[in-house]
């Protein structure tokens, strides 16, 4: 299962940590995808490492752990964020976070 804070808030110009927690007795995590709506933010692969989408490379920092640190937030960053955990065996698990960016 995926456990996450469903709603988080942060100030404009500040930063926020996007974090999902996956727990399973049988499946191991092989890859985690992070998306803003349908747009790819970053991917972590246990074997291949991190990939951060070029459009976000100046504002998205991998970590902590399998999460992301989103910096220099703007009001336009308000919205839904999705983590997708690829596991082996066991398939795909998804989590959702709503980020509200507030005026500073």
């Amino acid at each position: 299962t995926i456990d996450t804070k469903r709603n988080i808030s942060a100030e404009e110009g500040g930063s926020v940590i996007l974090q999902c927690h996956f727990s399973s007795d049988t499946a191991e995590v092989t890859q985690v995808d992070w998306k803003q709506q349908d747009q790819l933010l970053a991917i972590y692969s246990v074997d291949l490492g991190w990939h951060v989408a070029s459009v976000f490379s100046d504002r998205v920092v991998p970590g902590p752990s399998l999460g992301l640190t989103f910096q220099s937030l703007t009001m336009n960053d308000t919205g839904e964020y999705f983590c997708t955990y690829h596991t082996y065996p066991g398939g795909i698990y998804k989590g959702r976070i709503f980020l509200k960016v507030q005026e500073s």
Partner: antibody, heavy 125, light 107 residues
Framework: QLQLQESGPGLVKPSETLSLTCTVS??????????WAWIRQPPGKGLEWIGS???????YYNPSLKSRVTISVDTSKNQFSLKLSSVTATDTAVYYC?????????????????WGQGTMVTVSS | EIVMTQSPATLSVSPGERATLSCRAS??????LAWYQQKPGQAPRLLIY???TRATGIPARFSGSGSGTEFTLTISSLQSEDFAVYYC?????????FGGGTKVEIK
Amino acid sequence: QLQLQESGPGLVKPSETLSLTCTVSGGSISSSRYYWAWIRQPPGKGLEWIGSIGTSGSTYYNPSLKSRVTISVDTSKNQFSLKLSSVTATDTAVYYCAIEGANFRDFGYVAFDIWGQGTMVTVSS
Amino acid sequence: EIVMTQSPATLSVSPGERATLSCRASQSVSSNLAWYQQKPGQAPRLLIYGASTRATGIPARFSGSGSGTEFTLTISSLQSEDFAVYYCQQSPPWPRTFGGGTKVEIK
């Protein structure tokens, strides 16, 4: 540019274990972040993924073959290998080794970027 | 496991014409789709990854499109060297799976 070369016996008897090796040249297998994969193709048929091993040492196998397959890496020889036990005639195929993930860091996608030329293995008594 | 279905099984096209090959996934694979070309007696060659990005050295006449469950490989003007079998493949997740292939033959 990495290159791959499969080697192993072309004929295996039913119920025995098929053993193939893929030798990597043009780079070190231990310093590369890829998946090292085996794929096969029975005569006149399509491609079937057998399994992969990652740089973390994790192995991933086709569920239909999982009970019979072992993939391992020998970094000292710059090789990775496939063992398929209890073979039958249906395991007769061209066996390819391949590298997956060369474009991951730039684009976030994985595909079988580099292939060996393949080796034909026939299972027959 | 995700099942990949290609159509048609065989496509007869005249040189210089356009060829359109389809690939359908049994569930969404986002843009995690690759296309390969295989000629008789040869290993497959990567053409397209990420559904639409051409691999190094692949001519511009090859283009890929689609996302989710429906994908297309288009060869804008078939050359003699393009007559071959084409496979689609999804990844991730595990297990990696290939479509059954489309044979593009000379009409």
